[in-house]
Interface confidence: low
Amino acid sequence: RKIPKVGHTFFQKPESCPPVPGGSMKLDIGIINENQRVSMSRNIESRSTSPWNYTVTWDPNRYPSEVVQAQCRNLGCINAQGKEDISMNSVPIQQETLVVRRKHQGCSVSFQLEKVLVTVGCTCVTPVIHHVQ
Amino acid sequence: GITIPRNPGCPNSEDKNFPRTVMVNLNIHNRNTNTNPKRSSDYYNRSTSPWNLHRNEDPERYPSVIWEAKCRHLGCINADGNVDYHMNSVPIQQEILVLRREPPHCPNSFRLEKILVSVGCTCVTPIVHHVA
């Protein structure tokens, strides 16, 4: 069968696809690009006007087991004098990632994909001021 | 793989590590969280290091749409609304896991893939290198 144009019907499933039981999908957890590294500017969590700390969360029933979460250090932002300016706000920036959750029910084990919201850092924003009449 | 604690009464045939290939339920837990950052907050406009969001779409990946941040300025926005080049807007990058269709076009067969995304920008004091 020829592949129809995208936008009219879907891509046709190739004959070479592995058989998968209904309601499931096959997932290879050998990670592509496993060894790629983040090339962020050095120490930005300390140099930022909205600095943050990192906490490592560990869960042996999750893959990957280690997820790093950021927490903003201040409510306000750090000004040029190194003091906290509470007229501005440090706010978290978040990103979703996928993890595989391993569930034990008695002696049987099942796997579930899960979306996890990770706080990756903080940014300094002008606050939204609500005027009350 | 990683070691998993097991019920001591279970037979020993089960591998304690995550197997290389697993069958997972099609329903993704927490899948209905808001994935469009433009809808979830306006920090990208209100930040002193504002950024634009670019849509990256790949039908061979789940999620098929990922939003990439690009800092608007080299400097940061000061109290007067001008760009201050004594400070730097820098991207905050994060490695995330996505699903890559493998073999290509197969509806229910995937491999985990690690990708690097720029999630937003933050304003930092620059590292100044003094040349002797």
């Epitope: 129809p4 995208v6 936008g7 009219h8 019907t9 879907f10 891509f11 046709q12 499933k13 | 099609l26 329903n27 993704i28 899948r31 209905n32 994935t35 039908p59 789940y62 999620p63 098929s64 269709r101 509806p107």
Partner: nanobody, 122 residues
């Protein structure tokens, strides 16, 4: 914009059958699906069918009991539900989406009907 109108819901006894219909009008789409939401639960995927009608997908919980089909001439999709169980009680939504991919993810459906209530009770 696609307009979707569902019909065919109602009260049925356990073991009984119902046939839901979804009439679509507007621009073309790649796939149509049925999703459902039980009281206090997340919306979940039930079944999907490709724009051509060649490919069908089912949730494990309905496989063998429900059949999705479509009439291309009328741009109408159907869900034949047999051997209904109390746990099938939900509001059933018809939705369209672009692409075959991730038919089980309700986030990927763009246009939704208003829903039709199916109650399975004795």
């Amino acid at each position: 914009e696609v307009q979707l109108v569902e019909s065919g819901g109602g009260l049925v006894q356990p073991g009984g059958s119902l046939r839901l219909s979804c009439a679509a009008s507007g621009r073309t789409y790649d796939a149509m699906g049925w999703l459902r939401q039980a009281p206090g639960k997340e919306r979940e995927f039930v079944a999907a069918i490709s724009g051509s009608g060649d490919d069908t997908y089912y949730a494990d919980s309905v496989k063998g009991r429900f059949t999705i089909s479509k009439d291309n001439s009328k741009i109408t999709m159907y869900l034949q539900m047999n051997s209904l169980r109390p746990e099938d009680t939900a509001v059933y939504y018809c939705a369209t989406r672009r692409g075959l991919y991730y038919v089980w993810d309700s986030n990927d459906y763009e246009n939704w009907g208003q829903g039709t209530l199916v109650t399975v009770s004795s």
